[in-house]
Amino acid sequence: ECVTKVFKDISFQGGDLSTVFTPSATYCRLVCTHHPRCLLFTFMAESSSDDPTKWFACILKDSVTEILPMVNMTGAISGYSFKQCPQQLSTCSKDVYVNLDMKGMNYNSSVVKNARECQERCTDDAHCQFFTYATGYFPSVDHRKMCLLKYTRTGTPTTITKLNGVVSGFSLKSCGLSNLACIRDIFPNTVLADLNIDSVVAPDAFVCRRICTHHPTCLFFTFFSQAWPKESQRHLCLLKTSESGLPSTRITKSHALSGFSLQHCRHSVPVFCHPSFYNDTDFLGEELDIVDVKGQETCQKTCTNNARCQFFTYYPSHRLCNERNRRGRCYLKLSSNGSPTRILHGRGGISGYSLRLCKMDNVCTTKINPR
Amino acid sequence: ECVTKVFKDISFQGGDLSTVFTPSATYCRLVCTHHPRCLLFTFMAESSSDDPTKWFACILKDSVTEILPMVNMTGAISGYSFKQCPQQLSTCSKDVYVNLDMKGMNYNSSVVKNARECQERCTDDAHCQFFTYATGYFPSVDHRKMCLLKYTRTGTPTTITKLNGVVSGFSLKSCGLSNLACIRDIFPNTVLADLNIDSVVAPDAFVCRRICTHHPTCLFFTFFSQAWPKESQRHLCLLKTSESGLPSTRITKSHALSGFSLQHCRHSVPVFCHPSFYNDTDFLGEELDIVDVKGQETCQKTCTNNARCQFFTYYPSHRLCNERNRRGRCYLKLSSNGSPTRILHGRGGISGYSLRLCKMDNVCTTKINPR
């Protein structure tokens, strides 16, 4: 059920997944919506507590029943993710936040005319996730007009504090406003040797690229296919970065593919949504439910309609047994990061992903690839 | 593979599940062995760091590959759980620890003759998990001969500090040395209304009782069977306690069963090991692997031989299809607490648990019920 209303002075009890810091309840809901497991959130507004270090905390929550008990809490704002909602979603956030300092790794500083120019700098820098700009009213004269570009491991500030004379905001890459080079090539027989920031399991290089695109710090990736010699690394998608934003070393190896994040591209293909079916493929994960349905499309729809389902494996009925019209078995699954924990072949399953992330692709994208 | 050797001045890197405090590396390995997911541990011995609050930390670890990288660390002791080992295991620890204060909730104090009598008091008290005894050499004369009975939520101390003139140790309930009443009755149509400390999913009241027995603070339980009217509570095993150690209120309700922990019984039946098969029952959880095997016994054996497997669901081959000799499909599974996340019926699976916990039942038990 889609709940767009937010609940003022209310906190959801329990179900905590993690705590991040966001400048508003709206942005907190955005983070919750994009998080693989978050269904509910509680945001601690400014002045919600005597301890300013707790302000702007965005507590991401999950619940097996999709609901949690509500308790009164002054200054808290609670609500539900938009995963359960039909409308088109965007990761784009153009808002700027006056007198808020969003803390992160300050890796670049420069003097610019205004906050808009600072935001443009952030949008056109591969590493930048958010910025803080010291306006002409900033108390320290030496720091006025200074634009700080920032990033964190999670893509959200490590903390947020009140600070007069500054303006903060997020990169507009996801609004399709970046001028950074968009490299769509996937390089066969290529391993990139740079720093691994994370690894996930993926069925193919395209899904690996989408996961890299969706990841806060991934700039490029290497994917080991099913034919990769080292069994424990098959279907492994290595998410990578480098200081320059470009790979430093390319190694030629069969059955590996590499490529770039599409985070700063103007998308004409889905980058969040993995619409394909994978034949004779089992996705392993945490099981949510088992339902009997007719066909893999119905199984995918069932998964998409379940707010907690991230991927599925469908076993068709045994045609050998003259049961052509019988239902197959649909296993609804999830994991901590939204990707299967393992991928197996040769067991007769047909696997795929929930399509609820398709709502996050832009309108052109979904017209081209409506599923 | 069974590794009994411990590695001095070595720490395992990554894979952290949780940190508890234990008085020795031996006890740390015991905790790791009984933890549903722990396969490796790192114990921080006394003087392992400049910060005494880090001494006696027992870091429980897991790894998909069952191994982790080793790094040099002065004062650390690392090793593997005994899950992978064939020998009979015991939860019984008779050692006492001189000049160590094991911190917990001090809920009872009395003057006794010696440390042995203090340990007996702990063993004969329903809530007591461990104790600290102030000897005749304790600096404060007023506190000498004082026996403090303690418990924590986890069953292990919250911290451990050096303190001259004290002796600490654990309850000997698991050594079969408690004189506490052993109540084996399971009460049909009964709900106990006391404090819930945890809840898990179980296929029947006997498994629920074994889980309660294995839980550090559970004294009695209520189990809702498959016929319980509220669907979301079916197969729910509520683990309970009370200040007196006895249930305060019993409510008569159909399709519920209640009973007591067997933690202080001298066992003649398995209390850790769940050997039964559950027909037409699917155990849902996090999937580890899918293997094709002949028969549920082989599936159970495959699960038992996999150190990370906790339970399984086996789907027999379709006899309808004249494939009598074909292998069925064996799904190996795990969860955060060792119990299924859901139990479903009517889908044709045969489910059960790994038998690796059978090694923890005493010799009489396993002779009576060898599976």
Partner: nanobody, 124 residues
């Protein structure tokens, strides 16, 4: 306040039977331990039998197993001790005790509430 009242003691020949009763008032015996203890002159008080009143679990000292039976009537808040095949060494003052906690059921030091006792004499 809690009161326990024993009755049914007396003198009997060896091989005979007696039935002791313990009526509890001031608390409900629905989830407690009730025990029978005895003390012979010059000896320590020893546990004879106990019952968990929330069910039917019973506990006996080895010396009385098969001869003594403890039972309860929750409606009357009363616990009974049926003593058969009595022996001279069963001669003692018999006490009823109650503990509203999970305890070691045959250990006297674990019980909080005690009755005044009833004398049982078995002659040969």
């Amino acid at each position: 306040q809690v009161q326990l009242q024993e009755s049914g003691g007396g003198s009997v020949q060896a091989g005979g039977s007696l039935r002791l009763s313990c009526a509890a008032s001031g608390f409900t015996a629905s989830s407690n331990f009730m025990g029978w203890f005895r003390q012979a002159p010059g000896k320590e008080r020893e546990g004879v039998a106990a019952i968990y009143t929330g069910g039917a679990s019973t506990f006996y000292a080895d010396s009385v197993k098969g001869r003594f039976t403890i039972s309860q009537d929750n409606a009357k808040n009363t616990v009974y001790l049926e003593m058969d095949t009595l022996k001279p060494e069963d001669t003692a003052m018999y006490y009823c005790a109650a503990a509203p906690r999970w305890i070691a059921p045959l250990r006297a030091d674990r019980y909080e509430y005690w009755g005044q006792g009833t004398q049982v004499t078995v002659s040969s």
